[in-house]
């Protein structure tokens, strides 16, 4: 069981990237898929290594004073959805804005109908291109 | 099946890394090989997580405007080559130069005979003391 | 075979990272095992794909002029330790200081009894946020 | 909408050189292997050079070996051929082109540019 997805511009405003099976996508079979273009979901009970990649390009004078946050999230049948890793980098100084990437990754227990998900502080400044911005596990 | 090469310092003006067999690396078998010093080849057809680090030190001022971008690149046999994933951080404003490290990581379908290889946009940048540039990958 | 544990803030003045069995932990069984909340012990030959990341926040004018560096090192028994993987990120402008976030993650080779830990050059700036500092490691 | 624009192309005397440049735009230049094609009067297409989308790998009909130089700048979404050592039968409208498929031996293109003309004459 394994996926791999591609990052997708979204004109949401939610801060829940969107992801698409297009490009040099894995999608191994039906036990892992993606839903709603934003979360996957896993049917069996394991250990995942999941992992985000997340390119954006800020700058520190166009941005808030905050620094640029990527959340990997689990949100489980009935249970609120929580934090499993995040990573922070200040914005650039570099104009108009200067890119940087950030890589997550970990073992965690899913159960049946989990969900994971990537949270950001500020979408727009995703960067989209070829291989910038990607998310996926494996089934150990 | 599992690899993981270290990297090595190249006189050559190729953006692709080398890698060596050295230190404390991993080559678990005859179904992965390093080829050339520059790729790593598969003999068998599956899912494999792919990885890569990049350490590289650079100054704003010296280089392009351009970010450092490191690529993970696949070439299937037949094919031409493609990015997987890509990684950009924006130059340091330290002097001489400012160290930055990226980490690319991700689960990709490999045919048999082909090649996994790093490429990044200054190679004269990068790090190679011990554990700061490595490239490896995994079988599923 | 697998693991995932959570940075805890230490009053200890040593450069190894201390980890706790809290939050959303992983702790697959007694093959692998937390030792002195410090560093992860196995107890069986093979290899191992080992991860950390660690968020920190630094401030150039404040810091010594060395980068933060992140190191995985390995422990095996009757040797000295040695590295595994470092990653460097020079330290950042913003104040009172700028976060930034490293991965690092390989596949190595353990012996039986082999631990593996993390070292920094300043654990005082280490961010402890949920999800912000891991550590883990999963048998191939 | 792709567009390809070629320049560079001259009165040129034979034993000298020009270079070609190919500015491509409504597709990610990055992702696709690129080509130059010829026609010299009177005659049939016939392809020169192609370079893979990272510029890894380089091809050249057997013509041109050893004289003509493609090249490619992704962060500029161009295209170049250096052509040294020129010679009369080097004569041709040069277009760029854009493969159709991501398979190195089929030298099939689904877009191309208007083209520039080359004329090596004493």
């Known amino acids: 069981i394994a996926a791999h997805v591609i990052s997708e511009a979204s004109s949401k405003t939610t801060s829940v990237l969107q992801w698409a099976e297009k490009g040099y996508y894995t999608m191994s079979n039906n036990l892992v898929t993606l839903e709603n273009g934003k979360q996957l979901t896993v049917k069996r009970q394991g250990l995942y290594y999941i992992y985000a990649q997340v390119t954006f390009c800020s700058n520190r004078e166009a941005s808030s004073q905050a620094p640029f946050i990527a959340s990997l999230c689990l949100k489980s049948p009935g249970r609120f959805e929580r934090i499993l890793l995040r990573a922070a980098n200040t914005h650039s100084s570099a104009k108009p804005c200067g890119q940087q990437s950030i890589h997550l990754g970990g073992v965690f227990e899913l159960q049946p109908g989990a969900s994971v998900f990537v949270n950001v502080t500020d979408p727009s400044q995703v960067s989209h291109g070829t291989g910038f911005t990607s998310f996926g596990l494996l089934k150990l | 099946i599992a690899a993981h090469v270290i990297s090595e310092a190249s006189s050559k003006t190729t953006s692709v890394l080398q890698w060596a067999e050295k230190g404390y690396y991993t080559m678990s078998n005859n179904l992965v090989t390093l080829e050339n010093g520059k790729q790593l080849t598969v003999k068998r057809q599956g899912l494999y997580y792919i990885y890569a680090q990049v350490t590289f030190c650079s100054n704003r001022e010296a280089s392009s405007q351009a970010p450092f971008i490191a690529s993970l690149c696949l070439k299937s046999p037949g094919r031409f080559e493609r990015i997987l994933l890509r990684a950009a951080n924006t130059h340091s404003s330290a002097k001489p130069c400012g160290q930055q490290s990226i980490h690319l990581g991700g689960v990709f379908e490999l045919q048999p005979g082909a090649s996994v290889f790093v490429n990044v946009t200054d190679p004269s940048q990068v790090s190679h003391g011990t554990g700061f540039t490595s490239f490896g990958l995994l079988k599923l | 075979i697998a693991a995932h544990v959570i940075s805890e803030a230490s009053s200890k003045t040593t450069s190894v990272l201390q980890w706790a069995e809290k939050g959303y932990y992983t702790m697959s069984n007694n093959l692998v095992t937390l030792e002195n909340g410090k560093q992860l012990t196995v107890k069986r030959q093979g290899l191992y794909y080992i991860y950390a990341q660690v968020t920190f926040c630094s401030n150039r004018e404040a810091s010594s002029q060395a980068p933060f560096i992140a190191s995985l090192c390995l422990k095996s028994p009757g040797r000295f330790e040695r590295i595994l993987l470092r990653a460097a990120n020079t330290h950042s402008s913003a104040k009172p200081c700028g976060q930034q976030s490293i991965h690092l993650g390989g596949v190595f080779e353990l012996q039986p009894g082999a631990s593996v830990f993390v070292n920094v050059t300043d654990p005082s700036q280490v961010s402890h946020g949920t999800g912000f500092t891991s550590f883990g490691l999963l048998k191939l | 909408e792709v567009q390809l624009l070629e320049s560079g192309g001259g009165l040129v005397q034979p034993g000298g050189s020009l270079r070609l440049s190919c500015a491509a735009s409504?597709?990610?230049?990055?992702?696709?292997?690129m080509a130059w094609v010829r026609q010299a009067p009177g005659k049939g297409l016939e392809w020169v050079s192609t370079?893979?989308?990272?510029?890894?790998?380089?091809y050249y009909a057997d013509s041109v070996k050893g004289r003509f130089t493609i090249s490619r700048d992704n962060s500029k979404n161009t295209l170049y051929l250096q052509m040294n050592s020129l010679r009369a039968e080097d004569t041709a409208v040069y277009y760029c082109?854009?493969?159709?498929?991501?398979?190195?031996?089929?030298?099939?293109?689904?877009?191309w540019g208007q083209g520039t003309l080359v004329t090596v004459s004493s």
């Open positions: 082109a854009k493969h159709a498929t991501s398979q190195e031996s089929l030298r099939s293109f689904d877009y």
């Open positions: 409504g597709f990610t230049f990055e992702e696709y292997g």
């Open positions: 370079i893979s989308p990272l510029g890894i790998s380089t």
